[in-house]
């Protein structure tokens, strides 16, 4: 058993049928010695008396808010949560496996640049009695500071019969140098509590590996005289790290016909313009990627050919 | 990236082309190592990230773009000094910091070159003959060093009398390649920045 926060405790249980559970001793936070009784949640049934209460915690029915009283007055509370270990592996019931980029990916994180700011998000089908708390650091043995905000509900989607809820959090490394070569990964830890179930999820990454630039901005077409060709031009996104000559991007320009089956023409360039043939009803899209470290491509920025 | 790229003109800065070749070569070598050594811990998540140039060179600090010198988090240790007379210095206006930066890059390359050559000698003794260093990568390191053209003491190749532990050598190769790839990215960024300046 360990303390999650004041008066909230997590009991770790080896979870299998007929398991013996864990013996837990609760102590009433009071100078009083006599006439103390204990109850669980809203029940008025007295579970025991005295300054300490010994319980055998086996199932969720044994978890909850234990309260010690004296003469009708509440003295203190202890909330017990359960953390299930199933065959040596901590349970992951609360969050959905996003399966991207690989199986058992519960937390996904992205950064728009090298400033040390990043966003993480996760999915769940649970809509109520759910709380998250997020901590982060650079490295784990001698951790350096990363400050995270509160996790917020960022999207709701309907997936078949189920509703899916997306939560996200923004974090910022306290003293980040965009040019630094990372040798210690960022660690992100999310505590999730659903009713009386506690779970924790972690992700470990280098900022360089989670970079996904914003799409190029100010995408424009300039027709070339006496030609079906157009000059496409764009600019680096505002959110990208500067100077751009150091933090360079490479670009992919795509001409896509109206139907998805039509052949896509693609050109790759390090410049912020390209000459392409504009077909009728086609659209031109441009996306960006770090020129020197191949992390994710940005989403497409698009303009119609007409 | 295995995609057709319109290669930019190296312009006035002869080292840019060499640094791009270097990054391509080390990236290919790392990819080959990860595939060949699939039963070894060779992914970024599995290895310890060690920098053999730590406390010996300070390339990131010495080559920091002017725009980032206002960022206190970037100014850890900028007091390293190196020999200065590189042929990549495009004009006499080149600052002392730029010379310091390029000589730091040269020292990095020299250290990695020695490590890679020593490691290759060990790998050639492996009866499994599982993996060797790409000669192209070693050649590209050499070319960039020649382009930088710094006078520097030659570092003798380390020789080891004891029987090599091939498992450890292959893991060390992975560690080295990951670190060198990261340094090659920094070198490419620096060359691109200097070229634009």
């Amino acid at each position: 058993i360990w303390e999650l926060k004041k008066d909230v405790y997590v009991v770790e249980l080896d979870w299998y049928p007929d398991a013996p559970g864990e013996m837990v001793v609760l102590t009433c936070d009071t100078p009083e010695e006599d006439g103390i009784t204990w109850t669980l949640d809203q029940s008025s049934e007295v579970l025991g008396s005295g300054k300490t209460l010994t319980i055998q915690v086996k199932e969720f029915g044994d978890a909850g808010q234990y309260t010690c009283h004296k003469g009708g007055e509440v003295l203190s509370h202890s909330l017990l949560l359960l953390h299930k270990k199933e065959d040596g592996i901590w349970s992951t019931d609360i969050l959905k496996d996003q399966k991207e980029p690989k199986n058992k990916t519960f937390l996904r994180c992205e950064a728009k640049n090298y400033s040390g700011r990043f966003t993480c998000w996760w999915l769940t089908t649970i809509s109520t009695d759910l709380t998250f708390s997020v901590k982060s650091s650079r490295g784990s043995s001698d951790p350096q500071g990363v400050t995270c905000g509160a996790a917020t509900l960022s999207a709701e989607r309907v997936r078949g019969d189920n509703k899916e809820y997306e939560y996200s959090v923004e974090c910022q490394e306290d003293s980040a140098c965009p040019a630094a070569e990372e040798s210690l990964p960022i660690e992100v830890m999310v505590d999730a509590v659903h009713k009386l179930k506690y779970e924790n999820y972690t992700s470990s990454f280098f900022i360089r590996d989670i970079i996904k630039p914003d799409p190029p901005k100010n995408l424009q077409l300039k027709p070339l005289k006496n030609s079906r060709q157009v000059e496409v031009s764009w600019e680096y996104p505002d959110t990208w790290s500067t100077p751009h000559s150091y933090f360079s991007l490479t670009f992919c320009v795509q001409v896509q016909g109206k139907s998805k089956r039509e052949k896509k023409d693609r050109v790759f360039t390090d410049k912020t313009s390209a000459t392409v043939i504009c077909r009728k009803n086609a659209s031109i899209s441009v996306r960006a990627q770090d020129r020197y470290y191949s992390s994710s491509w940005s989403e497409w920025a698009s303009v119609p050919c007409s | 990236r295995n995609l057709p790229v319109a290669t930019p003109d190296p312009g006035m800065f002869p080292c840019l082309h060499h640094s791009q070749n270097l990054l391509r070569a080390v990236s290919n070598m790392l990819q080959k190592a990860r595939q060949t050594l699939e039963f070894y811990p060779c992914t970024s998540e599995e290895i310890d990230h060690e920098d053999i140039t730590k406390d010996k060179t300070s390339t990131v600090e010495a080559c920091l773009p002017l725009e980032l010198t206002k960022n206190e988090s970037c100014l850890n240790s900028r007091e390293t000094s190196f020999i200065t007379n590189g042929s990549c210095l495009a004009s006499r206006k080149t600052s002392f910091m730029m010379a310091l930066c390029l000589s730091s890059i040269y020292e990095d390359l020299k250290m990695y070159q020695v490590e890679f050559k020593t490691m290759n000698a060990k790998l050639l003794m492996d009866p499994k003959r599982q993996i060797f260093l790409d000669q192209n990568m070693l050649a590209v390191i050499d070319e960039l060093m020649q382009a930088l053209n710094f006078n520097s003491e030659t570092v003798p190749q380390k020789s080891s009398l004891e029987e090599p532990d091939f498992y450890k050598t292959k893991i060390k190769l992975c560690i080295l390649l990951h670190a060198f790839r990261i340094r090659a990215v920094t070198i490419d960024r620096v060359m691109s920045y200097l070229n634009a300046s």
């Epitope: 049928p17 007929d18 398991a19 199932e59 270990k85 199933e86 019931d93 199986n103 089908t125 | -």
Partner: antibody
Framework: QVQLVQSGGGVVQPGRSLRLSCAAS????????MHWVRQAPGKGLEWVAF????????YYADSVKGRFTISRDNSKNTLYLQMKSLRAEDTAVYYC????????WGQGTMVTVSS | SYVLTQPPSVSGTPGQRVTISCSGG????????VKWYQQLPGTAPKLLIY???QRPSGVPDRFSGSKSGTSASLAITGVQAEDEADYYC????????????FGTGTKVTVLG
Amino acid sequence: QVQLVQSGGGVVQPGRSLRLSCAASGFTFSSYGMHWVRQAPGKGLEWVAFIRYDGSNKYYADSVKGRFTISRDNSKNTLYLQMKSLRAEDTAVYYCKTHGSHDNWGQGTMVTVSS
Amino acid sequence: SYVLTQPPSVSGTPGQRVTISCSGGRSNIGSNQVKWYQQLPGTAPKLLIYGNDQRPSGVPDRFSGSKSGTSASLAITGVQAEDEADYYCQSYDRGTHPALLFGTGTKVTVLG
């Protein structure tokens, strides 16, 4: 004490269907994940499928994906395996088992797929 | 389709020490715990070892398990006639959990 009693096995022709049941008692069935494991005659153990305690997630071996469906009825304390498009290679003893460091197995039920 | 490799058979005379190996990889045994089962003919498997080296109550202490890196082993010190059975190791793969990964199985024969 924990008990898992299996039923539903038998002889069936290729391409036909069969449903296996596993009745649980002696524990809070709705709190635990459950597996199906099979063993072809003279062969080793092969995992077939898993279902979470609340039925929210199901996992299948590639060899049965799209043909077999694992399900549970927590009000009846029963686990099911619906097997469709049966093949000769599905012939095996099928076991249900609890998920956890200490597990409990059903007695096994024989499924024979033969024309 | 078996990722955990065991020797097909091992044998020993009563009182001898018999060991069975179970060889896997970094993503299974290297990252997860190992169990061992004993299966007597015509019966369901019986748990012998969980959590690499833990014995459930009721399992004789002549059975012991260990794990090192990407391999595990089961030792029977002082093998007895009633130990003649098939033995299976089991683990998980970090990418496909909760799918059970079973070893190929080992037939233990007690001679004499």
